[in-house]
Interface confidence: medium
């Protein structure tokens, strides 16, 4: 047979469908690999062929389109299951060809079981809602193309295992679920079950997504540097370890990149000829506000290092801020004999001002 452009196994499209539900799967060739659509290919005399490899088998075999009630069928560039069975799991290939042209791609299809509370190994999309932001909606995903607009399906919404009815702030509105005002207790998995008739049979589509309530843009502020601050002085003797934490609070901002970095004498630590290590930790609030801490560490600080300028910088989509750490060389306490000889008669020791020391 003639050479075929083989795009291999497209693992980017890990298609998961529920057992005993309809599934429509478009051939990925036209969506991601070729620059023309199915109609153009069909007009040019190209034929779309489907075959598959069962789970744990190497043998490619044709798809049986002659099953009772046309359980598996093809319509244009879509492979239909009405409905799926567990043993439909495998790698499916669609091949576009004529006598002079051939292109094919394979993709994995996993038929997944769910329990009565819609729990399953299905990877769930995440939808973020802003806390206390007014009415926001989620829409039952991936149901287009399953039934014509003349068919009026029934849609039931669930939170976890519970049918959504008489919830304080969540109202089902057909394909949409409206959150009058979103609270953190609205976090969770939401499932829409779409029921529609087709040729005397009733089919169900189950779609689950995860709602995560996040900080509202109306409450978002530029980064806030909690440390270093004016209350803390890093006073060290040469040879001691210098540890300065830079702790920054970032409001949640959709698609914002939160950055924290140190400069020493205006340069990145990598560009300074001293042995500096920086360790970062990140924590999140219940609304995905972020606290980043970068601890700057110099194991054995020198007198020269204690004269340098250490500045913590932070940036988000809301702005950029910076704060310098107050670093000083500790003045050794005068020895008692010297005190007497010099006639100071001091009773205390140290610098006479109050310091917090971070270790």
């Amino acid at each position: 047979s003639e050479r075929c452009d083989d795009w291999g196994l497209d693992t980017m499209r890990q298609i998961q469908v529920f057992e005993d539900e309809p599934a429509r799967i478009k051939c990925p060739l036209f969506e991601h690999f070729l620059k023309f659509n199915y109609s153009t290919a069909h007009s040019a005399g190209l034929t779309l062929i489907w075959y598959w490899t069962r789970q744990d088998r190497d043998l490619e075999e044709p798809i049986n389109f002659r099953l009772p009630e046309n359980r598996i069928s093809k319509e244009k560039d879509v492979l239909w299951f009405r409905p799926t069975l567990l043993n439909d799991t495998g790698n499916y290939t669609c091949m576009l060809r004529n006598t002079t042209y051939c292109s094919k791609v394979a993709f994995p299809l996993e038929v997944v079981q769910k329990d009565s509370c819609f729990n399953s190994p299905m990877k769930l999309p995440v939808h973020k809602l802003y806390i206390e932001y007014g009415i926001q909606r989620i829409t039952c995903p991936n149901v287009d193309g399953y039934f014509p607009s003349s068919v009026k399906p029934t849609i039931t919404w669930y939170m976890g295992c519970y049918k959504i009815q008489n919830f304080n702030n969540v109202i089902p509105e057909g394909m949409n679920l409206s959150f009058l005002i979103a609270f953190i207790s609205n976090n969770g998995n939401y499932t829409c079950v779409v029921t529609y008739p087709e040729n005397g049979r009733t089919f169900h589509l189950t779609r689950t997504l995860t709602v995560k309530v996040v900080g509202s843009p109306k409450n978002a502020v530029p980064p806030v540097i909690h440390s270093p601050n004016d209350h803390v002085v890093y006073e060290k003797e040469p040879g001691e370890e210098l540890l300065i934490p830079c702790t920054v609070y970032f409001s949640f901002l959709m698609d914002s990149r939160n950055e924290v970095w140190w400069t020493i004498d205006g340069k990145k630590p990598d560009d300074i000829p001293i042995d500096v290590t920086i360790n970062e930790s990140i924590s999140h609030s219940r609304t995905e506000d972020e606290t980043r801490t970068q601890i700057l560490s110099i194991k054995k600080v020198t007198s020269e290092d204690l004269k340098r300028s250490y500045v913590c910088h932070a940036r988000s989509a809301k702005g950029e801020v910076a704060k310098a750490a107050t670093v000083k060389q500790k003045v050794p306490a005068p020895r008692y004999t010297v005190e007497l000889a010099c006639g100071f008669g001091a009773t205390g020791s140290g610098s006479g001002s109050h310091h917090h020391h971070h270790h």
């Epitope: 976890g160 919830f167 304080n168 207790s185 609205n186 806030v224 909690h226 506000d289 606290t291």
Partner: antibody, heavy 122, light 107 residues
Framework: QLQLQESGPGLVKPSETLSLTCTVS??????????WGWIRQPPGKGLEWIGS???????DYNPSLKSRVSISVDTSKNQFSLKLSSVTAADTAVYYC??????????????WGQGNLVTVSS | DIQLTQSPSFLSASVGDRVTITCRAS??????LAWYQQKPGKAPKLLIY???TLQSGVPSRFSGSGSGTEFTLTISSLQPEDFATYYC?????????FGGGTKVEIK
């Protein structure tokens, strides 16, 4: 008026499992803006959050107790329960159940049970 | 975990005094802070939530302020029934944590 009432044994032997139930009256445990929590207070000491549950069964636990703690909810009985396994004398405390209200978006334990003193001793 | 440090631990005051209790968080918690009052042998009672919002039914002599890492509970004029232990609690992130408490005693 919402009320919470803890029930369960006041004495548990070391290495056994502590079991407490909180019965909610005057309101539904299935309200969509409430979490239900357990907090404990050793004699003469401060408060420690053990964990919280939502009516759907979703839980959050204090990492310091996570390996030993389990919180469950029974919406039909309007109750939620705490189980703490492998107890030691350090688990002796007054155990409170409480409602965490989210309707302001800011949370707080606005209703508490009267507390149940559990002593771990052989 | 977010640590909450309350100060002072003990406070002696007289009826009519203005009393201030401070709660410092180990990291920024926005306004996700509540204040509770606890009397011996009783469950804690919510006074303030969202750092500064007075819980329904709580006398207006109680007020809360602060945001980020520094928070304050103020009793403008101490009454006999206010002698108790006060706790702050952060609800910003899990695990939820409480301050160590401030005991307000009669001078």
């Amino acid at each position: 008026q919402l009320q919470l009432q803890e029930s369960g044994p006041g004495l548990v032997k070391p290495s056994e499992t502590l079991s407490l139930t909180c019965t909610v009256s005057g309101g539904s445990i299935s309200s969509s803006t409430y979490y239900w929590g357990w907090i404990r207070q050793p004699p003469g000491k401060g408060l420690e959050w053990i964990g919280s549950i939502y009516f759907t069964g979703s839980t959050d636990y204090n990492p310091s107790l996570k390996s030993r703690v389990s919180i469950s909810v029974d919406t039909s009985k309007n109750q939620f329960s705490l189980k703490l396994s492998s107890v030691t004398a350090a688990d002796t405390a007054v155990y409170y159940c409480a409602k965490e209200d989210d309707s302001s978006g800011y949370y707080s334990f606005d209703y508490w049970g009267q507390g149940n003193l559990v002593t771990v001793s052989s | 975990d977010i640590q909450l440090t309350q100060s002072p631990s003990f406070l002696s005051a007289s009826v009519g005094d203005r009393v201030t209790i401070t709660c410092r968080a180990s990291q920024g918690i926005s306004s996700y802070l509540a204040w509770y009052q606890q009397k011996p042998g009783k469950a804690p009672k919510l006074l303030i939530y969202a750092a500064s919002t007075l819980q329904s039914g709580v006398p207006s002599r109680f007020s809360g302020s602060g945001s980020g890492t520094e928070f304050t509970l103020t009793i403008s004029s101490l009454q006999p029934e206010d002698f108790a232990t006060y706790y702050c609690q952060q609800v910003n992130s899990y695990p939820l944590t409480f301050g160590g408490g401030t005991k307000v005693e009669i001078k």
